[in-house]
Structure formats: structure tokens, C-alpha cells
């Protein structure tokens, strides 16, 4: 199996009730605007075939995509939560910048690409869905990277 290195986040990143609350509130606000409840971005299909030792690297890829392709373009929406949550997630992304996998990560990239394709195919509603799943993103980072 591929070996992941530097794929760790300190527990303190997830022990800040205020920003956790804001992240969950942002997700809730966006999910209220999400009409396509049958599609799930962060779930079984994303994790399929990816062992827990590789999961943090997987979630780093999802986090970076979400920041660059979803949150930054939508940064004027869902205030005041967005202006607080985006810098927090960007800090997590920065702390995972040295998280790499030594070896073949094709199976991970394939799963991430499916998520990206789904968001792109759905257009703006795909971006809203991704914001509505920020609580899932947050929990998946917490589960995998600590």
C-alpha cells in the first residue's frame, strides 16, 4: 500500500467550538438551498477502495478542490459564515501542503475526479451542494487526519 507522509493535523484544529459551529452553520445554510438531495459528494463512493492510512491524503485533495473551485468563487454568498470558515479551511489546507503519498495514488485521484465531475456537471447547484457538505468535509478531515 502507498505510504503517506506528513498527513496529520493537530487535534487543536478541531477543538475550537466557535469555528466548528460556524462551519456547521454554513453547511446548514447552503443545504437549505440544495434541491438535489439524492446526490452525495462525500460518502461511500468517495471512500471506496481507499484505506484509512490514505484517507487524509484523499481529503486533502477534496479540501483543495473545494477551496479553489467552490468556496473562493462563491465567497460573497452565505455571509457572515463564509468569511470566517474559508480562512479556517485554507489554514487546514496549508498545514496539509506537505501531505503526500509515496507510490500509486491513481485509485484516489479517480475517486476525487468523480467528485469534481459531479460538481462541474451540476454547475452552480453542484457548488452549493459542496458548501452544504462542508460539515461532512470537516468531519472526514477530523476522522482521517488526527
Amino acid at each position: 500500500a502507498p505510504i503517506s507522509s506528513h498527513c496529520r493535523l493537530d487535534k487543536s484544529n478541531f477543538q475550537q467550538p466557535y469555528i466548528t459551529n460556524r462551519t456547521f452553520m454554513l453547511a446548514k445554510e447552503a443545504s437549505l438551498a440544495d434541491n438535489n438531495t439524492d446526490v452525495r459528494l462525500i460518502g461511500e463512493k468517495l471512500f471506496h477502495g481507499v484505506s484509512m492510512s490514505e484517507r487524509c491524503y484523499l481529503m486533502k485533495q477534496v479540501l483543495n478542490f473545494t477551496l479553489e473551485e467552490v468556496l473562493f468563487p462563491q465567497s460573497d454568498r452565505f455571509q457572515p459564515y463564509m468569511q470566517e470558515v474559508v480562512p479556517f479551511l485554507a489554514r487546514l489546507s496549508n498545514r496539509l501542503s506537505t501531505c503526500h503519498i509515496e507510490g500509486d495514488d491513481l485509485h484516489i485521484q479517480r475517486n476525487v475526479q468523480k467528485l469534481k465531475d459531479t460538481v462541474k456537471k451540476l454547475g452552480e447547484s453542484g457548488e452549493i451542494k459542496a458548501i452544504g457538505e462542508l460539515d461532512l468535509l470537516f468531519m472526514s478531515l477530523r476522522n482521517a487526519c488526527i
Partner: antibody, heavy 121, light 110 residues
Framework: EVQLVESGGGVVRPGGSLRLSCAAS????????MNWVRQAPGKGLEWVSG????????DYAASVKGRFTISRDNAKNSLYLQMNSLRAEDTALYHC??????????????WGRGTLVTVSS | QAALTQPASVSGSPGQSITISCTGA?????????VSWYQQHPGKAPKLIIY???KRPSGVSNRFSGSKSGNTASLTISGLQAEDEADYYC??????????FGGGTKLTVL
Amino acid sequence: EVQLVESGGGVVRPGGSLRLSCAASGFTFDDYGMNWVRQAPGKGLEWVSGVNWNGGTRDYAASVKGRFTISRDNAKNSLYLQMNSLRAEDTALYHCARGWYSGAAWNMGYWGRGTLVTVSS
Amino acid sequence: QAALTQPASVSGSPGQSITISCTGASGDVGAYNFVSWYQQHPGKAPKLIIYDVNKRPSGVSNRFSGSKSGNTASLTISGLQAEDEADYYCASLVSDFSVVFGGGTKLTVL
């Protein structure tokens, strides 16, 4: 076939301690977060504690925080709950539960039959 | 006190549809991406029937469906059958990383 078998329950006096165990088989144990959930006789379900795949995060219900400790031994495919300073209201059937899919421990798709803890003087 | 509120009981006749609601307490952070539903027959361990609001585990009948609207999640059982008589619990992960259950709903099939 996924199997979860709890043990370690019994009768204990208030203020006493017990250690529950859950032996897991039929799946790759260290790919899953695990939980303890209890049910007092004739009452509803109450989540007690959860732990992620590597023991890095441990979460507790407010009612047991500071008294109970969840842990896991991935080499032994086992989950534990150390219960100290037990109270009468801790009397319940304690279930070990696994997430339905890896990475989402809160979706408890597999349950053991439970082990009964009775706190009584 | 349960952090999620469910009706204590509901009833329906065979073939009918029934809906059980699950509402977050006032001021609760409704992380409703995380809602799951459990069925429990007397003397048995709970069984997961809905997860992630509206997903069904393999092997669970498509007569069971989940949805959410605002702070309220719902479980609908269509084509009610005698074996559906059981207790039903909703649950959700919330922002302090704990899982909260509803108080449970007893379903009676008339």
C-alpha cells in the same frame, strides 16, 4: 459476516468501576470508527462514546465525560469502555456499534447484542 | 432530555403510509447531513434503516425513505406492513462531535 460481541457487564456498586470489551470480526477493524451506545431498561437509545479508526479522536456524551474512557486495540480487533465512578443512572444494556461505511462512524450500521451493566447498592 | 424531538407514538393501517418527524431543539446546530434512522423490535438490537438523511443501506426495503426540511428530518414508511411495528429512533451527529438520539417513536400497525 460482521460480528460484534460485547462482554464485561455485571452488577457493581455505585462509585465502582467496570471495563467493557467488544470483540470485532468479519471486517478490517482499523478501517472503521466505533461507538458505544446504551439503553436503560424500557428507555430509549443513548450514545455514550465514539472513537475514530486510530484512537486519535475520542468523543463522549456529556453525561459520562470525565468518568468513562473509550479505547481500542487494533492488533486485537477490540474496542473497550472503561467506566469509573458508576452511578445508578448508568444502568443499561451497552451496545458496541460500527459505522455503516468506513469514515462515518455516526451511521451505526452494525450492532452487538449488548452487555448488561447494573449499578446498585 | 432528548436533543431531537420525535412523537411518542404513531399508528397506521396495513398498506397506508406514515411519517415520523424528528426536530432539532431550539438553538441546536442542525447538522442534518448526518441524520440516521433506526428500527428496533422488542428485545433486539437496533437496525440502521436510513443514513445521511436519505440513503438506504443495502437490504433495507425501499418502502423506507428519509428527507429533511429546515430543522426537521422525516422518516416515511409506505405500504405499511405488520412487521414494521417497532420503535423508531432518529439520530444526528452535532457540532460538539457527539451523537444525539431522538426519544423514539412507537409505531403501531392497526
